[in-house]
């Protein structure tokens, strides 16, 4: 059930994703002079019930210096915290990955773990893409991509996305839209989305205290 | 070009609230994790609190855990810090960051490629 491969590299583009399927794992990778302790976890992994999903194991990093004399431990979440609003699911927002079942919210930071995070995905993931700063989106279509199987092999849907320097012209004319905007789709391809017009990021995650579906604060 | 704005310091006595706001131009605001980090006279900028990028995961500093509460409004390009049951030791300069392009929390200041100014936050006992 694991993807074989890694979502598309798109060219100056990033992905991201809202939550992960149980299965997926998350390296535990340290930043340049640390390292993992010695009896510690290659990797957590979502797992959980029908109910509740969790990660799995602690990431632990040490100073490369030392011979584990002084532990980095992961910061663990006590207690999951949702702040729930009495306010209607709006069409204009997807419906929240997280708080679907079999899915992990995004594991709490731990002592000198490398910047960036490597994921180890599972068949039915979503990514969405984003182009880097001082490049602007030109779509024709969702800037995201799914992780399926198709005749007993995983592959990555192609994100409809090219990302261009901001002086250059568009390659299509009419086609420019908001970056990073999950779209509507057909209900056979996710179930994660409602169907959507076109809308940004900053308006599809409502993502203030007081428009959140729900917060979690990690302890 | 990126710029971090903060706003909202200013004296207050131990045990009141005071809301900071940090306003976000030149980037695409709702694709970023963000943070809070403060620094004491004398002390070294320490982490505070985080916010990923769709704003609804958290991450707080043991000291001010229960007390503060980070929030981002996507499409308003602000991130906010809520301070309550202010203490004289959270006195300090509040400087808001955005996390790197790749970082998935505002955690450490290697996650951090931009800062703001700053804005001064004084508790007086």
């Known amino acids: 059930e694991l993807c074989d491969d890694d979502p598309p590299e798109i060219p100056h583009a990033t992905f991201k994703a809202m939550a992960y399927k149980e299965g997926t794992m998350l390296n535990c990778e340290c930043k340049r002079g640390f390292r993992r302790i010695k009896s510690g976890s290659l990797y957590m992994l979502c797992t959980g019930n029908s109910s509740h999903s969790s990660w799995d194991n602690q990431c632990q990093c040490t100073s490369s210096a030392t011979r584990n004399t002084t532990k980095q431990v992961t910061p663990q979440p006590e207690e999951q915290k949702e702040r729930k609003t009495t306010e209607m699911q709006s069409p204009m927002q997807p419906v929240d990955q997280a708080s679907l079942p079999g899915h992990c919210r995004e594991p709490p930071p731990w002592e000198n773990e490398a910047t960036e995070r490597i994921y180890h995905f599972v068949v039915g993931q979503m990514v969405y893409y984003q182009c880097v700063q001082g490049y602007r989106a030109l779509h024709r279509g969702p800037a995201e991509s799914v992780c399926k199987m198709t005749h007993g092999k995983t592959r990555w849907t192609q994100p409809q996305l090219i990302c261009t320097g901001e002086m250059e012209t568009s390659q299509f004319p009419g086609e420019e839209k908001p970056q990073a905007s999950p779209e509507g789709r057909p209900e056979s391809e996710t179930s994660c989305l409602v169907t959507t017009t076109d809308f940004q990021i900053q308006t599809e995650m409502a993502a203030t205290m007081e428009t959140s579906i729900f917060t979690t604060e990690y302890q | 070009q990126v710029q971090l704005q903060e706003s909202g310091g200013g004296l207050v006595q131990a045990g009141d609230s005071l809301r900071l706001s940090c306003a976000a131009s030149?980037?695409?605001?709702?694709?970023?994790?963000m943070g809070w980090f403060r620094q004491a006279p004398g002390k070294e900028r320490e982490f505070v609190a985080t916010i990923t990028w769709t704003g609804r995961d958290t991450y707080y500093a043991d000291s001010v855990r229960g007390r503060f509460t980070i929030s981002k409004d996507n499409a308003k390009d602000t991130l906010f810090l809520q301070m309550n049951s202010l203490r004289p030791d959270d006195t300090g300069v509040y400087y808001c960051?955005?996390?790197?392009?790749?970082?998935?929390?505002?955690?450490?200041?290697?996650?951090?490629?931009?800062w703001g100014q700053g804005t001064q936050v004084t508790v007086s006992s």
């Open positions: 030149g980037f695409n605001f709702g694709w970023h994790a």
């Open positions: 960051a955005k996390a790197r392009e790749r970082a998935t929390w505002a955690y450490s200041e290697d996650d951090c490629d931009y």
